[in-house]
Interface confidence: low
């Protein structure tokens, strides 16, 4: 059960896993969520005790029953991890803490203009986990404007004290804001000789890299493959660091692979979610439960649905036995990784998928596309919504796309002249308009945000956000699409689809079933030659065939132009305008979403 509420003046009794220091209950909850074992926590605020050494302690807890007895405790704040929640979770923590000194290893001291610059310096320093900045009002003159960069083994402070006129905060590397070099190469037959800060078992080098990426102290790693000569060291993932931040020595070692943490990469990468299956592989760990299920996928689902399960091994039965069901061993460990990995025993192993929501949920795979045909099927475009207007009579108005659990992206021209968001309804998980009846669940719209430079579709800025009144739970039928990457990957979209319930041709009517059309992107220059009377800007993009035929039309407006890259769907365009529908040499014109990513983030994070 997902509990987001925090309980003030309340403590949870027992179940302690570990204690760390945290500047706030919200940060403590974030740490609990990312900790492999923590299900609940108690945070001791600065009013919680006569003893200042207990202030700002964050006690991470676990319980077989997923809850613990609550007791009255002055100044304590308790709550549950977000592991139990369906919504997306980010490790990014931007808050600044005034009059708090977060203690750690002060390894660098520099002068900065303000706390924001200090935070930026921390984000762009490979070792920095958090910082404390002495403001210009700080009592000691020689320390004013001094920015102390700090690190600890755990990435969290070793103590937190109240100190007037200082500001503390965390590195924003987890917000993908670092400018440090991002090295994605995996180096075969290579071992890095630097000191190990930790070692865990991993089934392959990519899981090892993901573990390194979200381990606070790991900067690079060496993975000893299953062919490694020394049996006891096979599948060992050695997490490493060095004073310089990069490997000092590399050794040529067969059957070892090495690489770097992706913590400084400027795009969202799946670092928590290990979705692969490992055949003929057994994961050892503390056994949580054994259940009979049909197939390894069902076993993974079982593990994902069991909140304490971290990984599993499925042992298939011969087809003739037990109705084809096998044994599903649900397991856990202190660090979330198997205690040992064995090969050649016939098991199929993998990890819980509940950590996938800590990565961007939009990156998870969806049902395979049905090739050919113009009608879509259920779950094919789970981000597509139908936006209805209820006055004077209820009808489909425009399309839109889910980009967050409370946010829909659509076209500005759909919303111009609406007197109130109250007459809008968002229906998600819908394939046929006929599914929309009086009692069909919908999301009300709390707020309409139209780009303030919008005048008319043909001039650009045809983009708007709808904030939903309530947050959406993601399912296979309704979930977000990724915004296009502003990060550091080459993106040339080869497969793009436009979807909607719009007309099939001018003068037609709204379609019942969601239609889809595969359309190629057209260069701006090419598009400009087709629309001589309009200025096709870099904030627009065009798609369609020279011979016409497949195109968006009336009623599709605001809907997505979805393009697939590296198995992930991106919202590349918003259906905006065009000359006719599917006319020869008249491609559809779309809002170029990548040019508005900053605007989208600014609006969705500010409200």
């Amino acid at each position: 059960e997902c509990v987001t509420k925090l309980f003030t003046d309340t403590g949870f009794q027992g179940g302690d896993v570990t204690t760390i220091f945290s500047p706030s209950a919200k940060h403590c909850q974030l740490i609990c969520t990312h900790h492999p074992r923590c299900l609940l926590f108690t945070f001791m605020a600065d009013s919680s005790s006569e003893d200042p050494t207990r202030w700002f302690t964050c006690i991470l807890k676990d319980s077989v029953t997923e809850t613990l007895p609550r007791v009255n405790m002055t100044g304590a704040i308790s709550g549950y991890s977000f592991k139990q929640c369906p919504h997306q979770i980010s490790a990014c923590h931007r808050n600044l803490y005034v009059d708090l000194d977060m203690k750690g290893m002060n390894y660098n001291s520099l002068m900065t203009r303000d706390a924001q610059e200090c935070q930026e310096r921390c984000t762009n320093d490979v070792h920095c986990h958090f910082f404390t900045y002495a403001t210009r009002q700080f009592p000691s003159t020689e320390h004013r404007n001094i920015c102390l960069l700090k690190y600890t083994h755990m990435g969290t402070p070793t103590r937190i004290m109240k100190l007037t006129k200082v500001v503390s905060g965390f590195s924003l590397k987890s917000c993908a804001l670092s400018k440090l070099a991002c090295i994605r190469d995996i180096f075969p037959s290579t071992a890095f000789a630097d000191s190990n800060i930790d070692s865990v078992m991993a089934p392959d080098v990519f899981v090892c890299r993901r573990i390194c990426t979200h381990h606070p102290g790991c900067l690079f790693f060496t993975f000893l493959s299953q062919e490694w000569p020394k049996e006891s060291e096979r599948n060992l993932c050695l997490l490493k660091t060095s004073e310089s931040g990069l490997p000092s020595t590399r050794i040529k070692k067969d059957r070892a692979l090495s690489g770097f943490s992706l913590q400084t990469c400027r795009h969202s990468v799946p670092v928590f979610c290990h979705s692969s299956f490992y055949h003929d592989t057994d994961f050892l760990g503390e056994e949580l439960d054994i259940v009979d299920v049909k197939g390894h996928e069902a076993c993974q689902k079982m593990c994902t649905d069991s909140i304490r399960c971290q990984f599993f091994t499925y042992s298939p039965s011969p087809e003739s036995c037990n109705g084809g069901k096998g044994k599903c061993y649900l397991k856990l460990s202190s660090n979330g990784s198997p205690t040992k990995i064995l090969h050649g025993r016939g098991g199929i192993s993998g990890y819980t998928l509940r950590l996938c929501k800590m990565d961007n949920v939009c990156t998870t795979k969806i049902k395979p596309r049905i090739v050919g045909g113009e009608a879509s099927v259920h779950g094919e475009w789970p981000w597509q919504i139908t936006l209805h207007i209820t006055s004077p009579a209820q009808r489909h108005l425009c399309g839109g796309s889910i980009i967050g659990n409370q946010w829909i992206l659509t076209a500005a021209h759909c919303l111009i002249g609406l007197e109130s968001p109250k007459i809008l309804r968002v229906y998600s998980g819908i394939l046929n308009q006929s599914e929309v009846k009086k009692d069909t669940a919908f999301f009300g719209v709390q707020e309409i945000i139209i780009h303030d430079q919008y005048e008319m579709a043909e001039s650009g800025y045809d983009i708007a956000l709808l904030k939903l009144e309530t947050a959406m739970n993601y399912t296979d039928a309704q979930r977000p699409i990724c915004l296009p990457s502003k990060g550091d990957r080459s993106v040339i979209y080869a497969e793009c689809w436009v979807t909607g319930w719009g007309y099939r041709k001018l003068g037609d009517k709204i379609q019942n079933t969601l239609q889809k059309a595969n359309v190629p992107l057209v260069t701006t220059e090419e598009c400009q030659t087709r629309y001589r009377g309009h200025k096709i800007t870099n904030k627009m993009l065009c798609a369609g065939y020279q011979e016409g035929g497949k195109d968006a039309c009336k009623g599709d407006s605001g809907g997505p132009l979805s393009c697939k890259h590296n198995d992930v769907w991106h919202l590349v365009g918003i259906t905006s305008w065009g000359e006719g529908c599917g006319q020869r040499e008249r491609p559809g014109v779309y809002t170029n979403v990548v040019e508005y990513v900053d605007w989208i983030l600014e609006k969705t994070q500010a409200v």
């Epitope: 762009n124 490979v126 400018k179 440090l180 070099a181 991002c182 090295i183 994605r184 190469d185 310089s244 931040g245 990069l246 490997p247 000092s248 590399r250 400027r266 296009p484 990457s485 502003k486 990060g487 550091d488 990957r489 080459s490 993106v491 040339i492 990548v594 990513v597 900053d598």
Partner: antibody
Framework: QVQLEESGPGLVAPSQSLSITCTVS????????IYWVRQPPGKGLEWLGM???????DYNSALKSRLSISKDNSKSQVFLKMNSLQTDDTARYYC??????????WGQGTTLTVSS | DIVMTQSHKFMSTSVGDRVSITCKAS??????VAWYQQKPGQSPKLLIY???YRNTGVPDRFTGSGSGTDFTFTISSVQAEDLAVYYC?????????FGGGTKLERL
């Protein structure tokens, strides 16, 4: 395949401004940083600045006040603008793709002469 | 900004010789140093990155070493086609910066 090509005015008078375009193909500008380097005749390489895939910029401190780098992702073009040119800005100007690991690509460069 | 200094502007060598070019950084750049080769009329070509990693297709006579502030680029057996200018560059932190270059010429 990956290609970068610089185009510039060739000759500019002192105190005037410079605008050089780097047109890329084979990859998307939303995905990679592009940096600018110049080389005066018979001299070494000087790193001028760069624009990241997400549009943020970094500049050589000594030239920051005169430099501006921008881009148009849809046209696959990056622009270097430099004002108050002097004769010692005479150089060959290169654009290069920022590499991650071992991938590195440079344009052939465009020659700029600052002279009255 | 980080300043990269190559102490030798010129170095003389013969075919078959072993030659080492040094580069010093004004502050710790970890091992994020690259080495470029430039021949007359050509764009620079990346040989080594992250101090010791050879770029694809670069012969193994070219090696790099060092960390922190002191770096060395070595050609174990100079070939005629190696006569060129060599530059070090720090790619630890923007703004990236180059050394002044070392011209390798025939003795």
């Amino acid at each position: 395949q990956v290609q970068l090509e610089e185009s510039g005015p060739g000759l500019v008078a002192p105190s005037q401004s410079l605008s050089i375009t780097c047109t890329v193909s084979g990859f998307s500008l939303t995905g990679y940083g592009i940096y600018w380097v110049r080389q005066p005749p018979g001299k070494g390489l000087e790193w001028l600045g760069m624009i990241w895939g997400d549009g943020r910029t970094d500049y050589n401190s000594a030239l920051k006040s005169r430099l501006s780098i921008s881009k148009d992702n849809s046209k696959s073009q990056v622009f270097l603008k430099m004002n108050s040119l002097q004769t010692d800005d005479t150089a060959r100007y290169y654009c290069a793709r920022d590499y991650y690991g071992s991938k590195d690509y440079w344009g052939q460069g465009t020659t700029l002469t600052v002279s009255s | 900004d980080i300043v990269m200094t190559q102490s030798h502007k010129f170095m003389s060598t013969s075919v078959g010789d072993r030659v080492s070019i040094t580069c010093k950084a004004s502050q710790d750049v970890s091992t994020a140093v690259a080495w470029y080769q430039q021949k007359p009329g050509q764009s620079p070509k990346l040989l080594i990155y992250l101090t010791s990693y050879r770029n694809t297709g670069v012969p193994d006579r070219f090696t790099g070493s060092g960390s922190g502030t002191d770096f060395t680029f070595t050609i174990s057996s100079v070939q005629a086609e190696d006569l060129a200018v060599y530059y070090c560059q720090q790619h630890y932190k923007t703004p990236y910066s180059f050394g002044g270059g070392t011209k390798l010429e025939r003795l």
